[in-house]
């Protein structure tokens, strides 16, 4: 069964900088990745980035840089211009559209106890979407 993992990492040197890492475990080819925050895409979440494996990226503030890390994983750097860190208690969701499996989505957040520089363990919450 395909699975999506999500890791949220706070930068040690910059408390207002976060990186979201997402990956797809399973067969099939990925056709699109959508990263959102505040909930799943289309279900109350706000879109932060869309990545296409051939055609590039679109991203929206506070996203700084969305990029492919491997053929099945991406990273999204986020930066808050304010003094506080609004990302600490935020849920980030990654949706992978793949062929022929359909769409799979998982969400994760930074645990309250996390020290800067430590990444959260994978917290997959699979949401199967038969698109």
């Amino acid at each position: 069964t395909p699975e999506v993992w999500v890791q949220v990492q706070m930068e040690a040197t910059e408390l207002s900088s976060f990186t979201v890492h997402c990956g797809f475990l399973g067969p099939g080819s990925i056709s699109l990745v959508t990263v959102s925050w505040g909930g799943p895409d289309g279900a109350g979440g706000t879109k932060l980035a869309v990545l296409h494996p051939e055609l590039g990226t679109r991203q929206w503030a506070p996203a700084r840089q969305a990029r492919w890390e491997t053929q099945s994983s991406i990273s999204l750097a986020l930066e808050d211009s304010g003094a506080s860190s609004p990302f600490a208690n935020t849920t980030f969701c990654c949706k992978f559209a793949s062929f022929p499996e359909g769409s799979w989505e998982s969400c994760g957040s930074l645990p309250p106890s996390s020290d800067p520089g430590l990444s959260a363990p994978p917290t997959p919450v699979p949401i199967l979407r038969a698109d």
Partner: antibody
Amino acid sequence: EVQLQQSGPELVKPGSSVKISCEASGFTFADYNVDWVKQSHGKSLEWIGAINPNDGGTSYNQKFEGKATLTVDKSSTTAYMELRSLTSEDSAVYYCARWVNNDWYFDVWGTGTTVTVSS
Amino acid sequence: DIVMTQSQKFMSTSVGDRVSITCKASQNVRSAVDWYQQKPGQSPKTLIHSASNRHTGVPDRFTGSGSGTDFTLTISNIQSEDLADYFCLQHWNYPYTFGGGTKLEVK
């Protein structure tokens, strides 16, 4: 006919601000992002940033953060770009362009707005 | 930032000829490259998207090819109205970046 009609030329003083517009017609405004591009005299093109008319979400080239602010007015299907603290380096032609979300490219370009910064 | 290099700043050609304009990316950008034509005093117009897909209404004399780091816009059977600047654009990573442009002169 799909069109992006931009506001007319601007002659402005150093240190001031200017707000230029890009009025969309002939298509559903909310279905496309609007990007902005700078072309300095005799030079190539520079991507400034983009805005999503649905929620006002923006993304900027870091080079233009603090210089450009993108907004939209859905009721008038118009996108705006405000440029502040103008210097002679900001003298250029500015274009808006329609980004096709499903096909990943700019298919329609605006008419262009010439901004001249001079005292 | 990804640098898009159009090494030929100027190219001279004659009506009926064929010319290839190249664009090299500083890193792999897959197929995330488009080509734009800008005639003197006009706004840019879209020719090719996704490296090789012709935009609606563009004559089939214009062909795009390449992937990864090397991209080519080929114009065959050149017409006098092809006198223009030609720019490539990458949208693989932010910020999107354009090539410096190639000015085509038709003799």
